[in-house]
Interface confidence: medium
């Protein structure tokens, strides 16, 4: 399977909410011995590989923001901890998963990575990620709402297997 990022850049005004989205394309293994783990984290544009460094989003680590289930089930993060930080990650039945950030500040700007790990117990782990940039702007040049820029087909398939 692949992870695609429909949008590679989100430009948003301070105070707005933003929902960053990733999409799983292709078959994901199903069965009692398969676990799908999805999460989000901040990273930097590493020289070797994007998304290798894992930094917290609003002090929440990728472990705090994970979604964890078998197959393509819908899921949400534990609401209490994430919502206290104005965050919510969610997943639907169609391979889409997202993180919503409320009341954006300039400090939220950065490179966001979504991570999917397919665990086939007793066999292997397959790790895939996608990356997108969030720019939070303030002042007269800031847009009134979030403006999103579609990924080129080449950029949107950021595939890393493990």
């Amino acid at each position: 399977f692949k992870v695609t990022t429909p949008y590679s850049l989100y430009v948003c005004p301070e105070g707005q909410n933003a929902t960053l989205t990733c999409r799983i394309l292709g078959p994901v293994s199903k069965g009692h011995d398969v676990t799908i783990y999805k999460t989000w984290y901040l990273s930097s544009r590493g020289e070797v590989q994007m998304c290798s460094e894992r930094r917290p989003i609003r002090n929440l680590t990728f472990q705090d923001l994970h979604l964890h289930h078998g197959g393509h089930q819908a899921a949400n993060t534990s609401h209490d901890l994430a919502q206290r930080h104005g965050l919510e990650s969610a997943s639907d039945h169609h391979g889409n998963f997202s993180i919503t950030m409320r009341n954006l500040t300039l400090l939220d700007s950065g490179l966001y990575c979504c991570l999917v790990v397919e665990i086939r117990h007793h066999h292997s782990e397959h790790r895939v990620h996608g990356a997108m940039e969030l720019q939070v702007q303030t002042g007269k040049d800031a847009p009134s709402n979030c403006v999103v820029y579609p990924s080129s087909s080449q950029d949107s398939e950021n595939i890393t297997a493990a």
């Epitope: 676990t35 290798s52 894992r54 964890h68 991570l115 117990h121 782990e125 493990a162």
Partner: antibody, heavy 118, light 106 residues
Amino acid sequence: EVQLQQSGPELVKPGASMKISCKASGFSFTGYTMNWVKQSHGKNLEWIGLISPYNGGTSYNQKFKGKATLTVDKSSSTAYMELLSLTSEDSAVYYCARRAYGYAMDYWGQGTSVTVSS
Amino acid sequence: QIVLTQSPAIMSASPGEKVTMTCSASSSVSYMFWYQQKPGSSPRLLIYDTSNLASGVPLRFSGSGSGTSYSLTISRMEAEDAATYYCQQWSSYPFTFGSGTKLEIK
């Protein structure tokens, strides 16, 4: 503060079985897998297996199937490893360690020393 | 299973000296992880995903590599770095560790 507190050292007789506990605190127990690692004679590390407190799912190193049984008690955030039909080869230090999927074992228990001797 | 071979098995270095140890995998792995263990203590995560420092790890440590060949480097040896270092892979079951490199201070 993240902590993994393991049960104390054990001296057991050959052929007996025993259970080691690993009590987790300071983090969401169901958000990680709990892994068990054997270290013999202060040298090589061997991965025994893992259990997901989220759904109770386990994965074992084939070498330890039938030797180790992993369980969890979510209500007390405790992982257990039972070692069966012990022999001198099982004398070692056993560690529990937490791991997030797609990551590494970032916190380890202090280790439980098991000595099998008649 | 994937066998990880570490070399050298034992090495010594003077304070301030650069140290490099290697980990060779019998099959290609996507990422390598490194742990440090001192006598009487539990292993400690040093490096994840081949080259990223775990929280609290000094900047003198670095990791690199790909495929079947990986290395851990200490830019300037310090006395507190004397320990045994293990590489480990999570790419395929069973997850395996290297046999360790024991680093001593001269």
